[in-house]
Interface confidence: low
């Protein structure tokens, strides 16, 4: 895995950033956000963009505000594109963000992590030489 591509690095960074935010779930605005789950094949990138667009916000409760805001900013960074991502952008049959069940921040982050793990697994599976550990 030493020569892993930038896409994989970025997706794994996102997982750890989600884990980081889970530490501060009590400092997030407790509003309900669209949280895709059991995403159908070929709609992963559409669901990913729903997670990125969601209005996850710091509750401005003090010490943790800075790191929460930086984490949220990083979650919204555009990841390196892949062929699969480019293909999926043209699909019009994926559910709209508003059609997904809305969940509070804790469940929202858990579902986001689950989607990221699924996307990493798919990416690894699509590479005939890929393995999960170095």
């Amino acid at each position: 895995m030493q020569g892993q591509d930038r896409h994989m690095i970025r997706m794994r960074q996102l997982i750890d950033i989600v884990d980081q935010l889970k530490n501060y779930v009590n400092d997030l605005v407790p509003e309900f956000l669209p949280a895709p789950e059991d995403v159908e094949t070929n709609c992963e990138w559409s669901a990913f963009s729903c997670f990125q667009k969601a209005q996850l916000k710091s509750a401005n409760t003090g010490n943790n505000e800075r790191i929460i805001n930086v984490s949220i900013k990083k979650l919204k960074r555009k990841p390196p594109s892949t062929n699969a991502g480019r293909r999926q952008k043209h699909r019009l049959t994926c559910p709209s963000c508003d059609s997904y069940e809305k969940k509070p921040p804790k469940e929202f982050l858990e579902r986001f992590k689950s989607l990221l793990q699924k996307m990493i697994h798919q990416h690894l599976s699509s590479r005939t030489h890929g393995s999960e550990d170095s």
Partner: antibody, heavy 120, light 107 residues
Framework: EVQLVESGGGLVKPGGSLRLSCAAS????????MNWVRQAPGKGLEWVSS????????HYAESVKGRFTISRDNAKNSLYLQMNSLRAEDTAVYYC?????????????WGQGTTVTVSS | AIQLTQSPSSLSASVGDRVTITCRAS??????LAWYQQKPGKAPKILIH???SLESGVPSRFSGSGSGTDFTLTISSLQPEDFATYYC?????????FGQGTKLEIK
């Protein structure tokens, strides 16, 4: 207080083995990637190994690959480094280090270090 | 492996001086770079993450800049407690690597 405390260092002969441990406290250990970083006497810092929060991804420096094994026990808030086939050049202070957000936040918590001396 | 080259290797300066340390990566590492300060016999302490984000509790006289391959750590006005060794580290890809260090000494 967020804290990392290493143990297990000592004097060992070339070819011997040691197991370093790191006890974490004051934070949710299971949410963080962890690393071992070493520093030979009078030298700079050298990254040794990393393990992600759920032990899903593990990486090693070329200099230790095949000889060292990193592991963690989230239930015990502990990180380990099993070091086999030790060489004189492995002599160093070994630091247990917490990593945030795949490095975008850097390595923010360091232990005090444990000294490993490999000598006949 | 990505190589990080710090310059200068050592530097003599006086209290109140403005000091700049550079770190050059052998390939593009985006902003995945941190800076650390280490004093003799102590563990390193993080100063800057994500190339330019100041770590909580670190004095504002420290600042980081850069992206891609060229990075800079600046101390705007040296204080007595700033004399130490400084390291950069990249997190863009494995193996993670450190620069060789810059020793900042009192002139």
């Amino acid at each position: 207080e967020v804290q990392l405390v290493e143990s297990g260092g000592g004097l060992v002969k070339p070819g011997g083995s040691l197991r370093l441990s790191c006890a974490a406290s004051g934070f949710i250990f299971s949410s963080y990637s962890m690393n071992w970083v070493r520093q030979a006497p009078g030298k700079g810092l050298e990254w040794v190994s990393s393990i992600t929060s759920g032990s899903y991804y593990i990486h090693y420096a070329e200099s230790v690959k095949g000889r060292f094994t990193i592991s963690r026990d989230n239930a015990k808030n502990s990180l380990y480094l099993q070091m086999n086939s030790l060489r004189a050049e492995d002599t160093a202070v070994y630091y247990c280090v917490r990593e945030r957000g795949w490095g975008y936040y850097g390595m923010d918590v360091w232990g005090q270090g444990t000294t490993v001396t490999v000598s006949s | 492996a990505i190589q990080l080259t710090q310059s200068p290797s050592s530097l003599s300066a006086s209290v109140g001086d403005r000091v700049t340390i550079t770190c050059r990566a052998s390939q593009d590492i985006d902003s995945a770079l941190a800076w650390y300060q280490q004093k003799p016999g102590k563990a390193p302490k993080i100063l800057i993450h994500d190339a330019s984000s100041l770590e909580s509790g670190v004095p504002s006289r420290f600042s980081g800049s850069g992206s891609g391959t060229d990075f800079t750590l600046t101390i705007s006005s040296l204080q007595p407690e700033d004399f130490a060794t400084y390291y950069c580290q990249q997190f863009n890809s494995y193996p993670y690597t450190f620069g060789q260090g810059t020793k900042l000494e009192i002139k």
